[in-house]
């Protein structure tokens, strides 16, 4: 990394949790002095180029579309900027996960799915027939990898005290430590609704 420049960003334009054969668009922050941008995948500490954009598109952030997502394309990605024959800058890293490689787990809740702010709820992810050693809880629409992760089996995810932002549709996935970017099919969905008392009647009626 050159000098004290801030590290350029890399981002997925949709969820980084991608179904088998799905697609995702990756965006690298444009670097003014770079004459080309390479998209690298990092496997076993080895960098392999999987895409390359020339400077032609001016200040537009270079974009890369990964089609037909599979196990080989899951992993850690980084943008590599070429600013001279032997001079590079690098972005932060982005992790992409592929789902649909194993059977789906089951997601359940320890109470009703309509909550008031400040209340607690625990979601449990379990798999009767597949001995996953990790589970992740994902909220639909999130543009980053799920932060909720557990090594227990079954996995208990405590949410709370909740606020209105906790509302949403949740699913869980099972995976193995040895292959952290290869996940199961999504579990059944649970929709959590966090509402204050003003809207309680409306929620109950619907």
């Amino acid at each position: 990394q050159e000098g004290d420049f801030p590290m350029p960003f890399i981002s997925a334009k949709s969820s980084p949790v991608i179904p088998l054969d799905g697609s995702v668009k990756i965006q690298c922050q444009a670097i003014r002095e770079a004459y080309l941008t390479q998209l690298m995948i990092i496997k076993n500490s080895t960098y392999r180029e999987i895409g390359r954009r020339l400077k032609f598109w001016n200040e537009t952030d270079p974009e890369f579309v990964i089609d037909h997502m599979d196990a080989n394309k899951a992993g850690r990605y980084q943008c590599q900027y070429r600013i001279g024959h032997y001079r590079f800058r690098y972005s932060d890293t982005l992790e992409l996960v592929v789902t649909g490689l194993y059977g789906k787990p089951f997601l359940s809740a320890d109470r009703g799915l309509v909550l008031m702010p400040g209340e607690n709820i625990s979601l449990t992810c379990s798999s009767a027939h597949i001995p996953f050693d990790r589970f992740s809880l994902a909220k639909e629409g999130e543009l980053s990898l799920p932060q909720h992760q557990s090594g227990e089996h079954p996995a208990n995810f405590s949410l709370g005290p909740v606020d209105l932002n906790v509302s949403g549709i949740y699913r869980c996935y099972g995976w193995y430590n040895r292959s952290p970017y290869l996940w199961s099919f999504p579990s059944n969905a649970l929709e959590l609704v966090v509402t204050d008392s003003i809207h309680q009647d409306y929620t109950t009626q619907n």
Partner: antibody
Framework: EVQLVESGGGLVKPGGSLKLSCAAS????????MSWVRQTPDKRLEWVAT????????YYPDNVKGRFTISRDNAKNNLYLQMSSLRSEDTAMYYC?????????????WGQGTTLTVSS | DVQITQSPSYLAASPGETITINCRAS??????LAWYQEKPGKTNMLLIY???TLQSGVPSRFSGSGSGTDFTLTISSLEPEDLAMYYC?????????FGGGTKLEIK
């Protein structure tokens, strides 16, 4: 299934104009750069024009710059090539091609082509 | 502009044989050479890019090698359906340029 279908070719006199169209289907059109590539009567392939996925930027080789204009309508999934000041050396089969989502200048899907003949 | 010289322009071989087609660039293009197949009645098909990366869905009997200025397309265990025109193309720098093509006939 990715499909690209060109239309609009025909016989034009030198100095004339013509607009080619390409209808795309089977993929998210707005995600991909699109190009025109032509094949001359002696079977040589020549890259003609490229347009960035968002439709903001265009690029041409020197021999068509100022005479050809590439454009796209992402809402209709259509790509166009407006050609003017046509010359006999523009006679060719014109192909619409999709750039891969990963590399500039790399074409992973092509149409069947439409023929332009420039002759008096 | 990068000039691409492709050879031979014509090639005839029998099923089961291994053939090679060569492309030479007028200046170094690193590894950025692609190969396409053109078959009558079908749309052009990307076979190989970045010198040696096989495009998804392309049979493994097609392979590419080379870097810098000299590149080779190898088709092993030739099949009757490989009858086609083959083109190389540099995707290193604008303007993108193609080789003159190789017509492969099956004996």
């Amino acid at each position: 299934e990715v499909q690209l279908v060109e239309s609009g070719g025909g016989l034009v006199k030198p100095g004339g104009s013509l607009k080619l169209s390409c209808a795309a289907s089977g993929f998210t059109f707005s995600n991909y750069g699109m190009s025109w590539v032509r094949q001359t009567p002696d079977k040589r392939l020549e890259w003609v024009a490229t347009m960035h996925s968002g439709g903001t930027y265009t690029y041409y080789p020197d021999n068509v710059k100022g005479r050809f204009t590439i454009s796209r309508d992402n809402a209709k999934n259509n790509l166009y090539l407006q050609m003017s000041s046509l010359r006999s050396e523009d006679t060719a089969m014109y192909y619409c091609a999709r750039e891969t989502g990963l590399y500039d200048g790399l074409f992973d899907f092509w149409g069947q082509g439409t023929t332009l003949t420039v002759s008096s | 502009d990068v000039q691409i010289t492709q050879s031979p322009s014509y090639l005839a071989a029998s099923p089961g044989e291994t053939i090679t087609i060569n492309c030479r660039a007028s200046k170094t293009i690193s590894k950025y050479l692609a190969w396409y197949q053109e078959k009558p009645g079908k749309t052009n098909m990307l076979l190989i890019y970045s010198g040696s990366t096989l495009q998804s869905g392309v049979p493994s009997r097609f392979s590419g090698s080379g870097s810098g200025t000299d590149f080779t397309l190898t088709i092993s265990s030739l099949e009757p359906e490989d009858l086609a025109m083959y083109y190389c193309q540099q995707h290193d720098e604008y303007p993108w340029t193609f080789g003159g093509g190789t017509k492969l006939e099956i004996k």
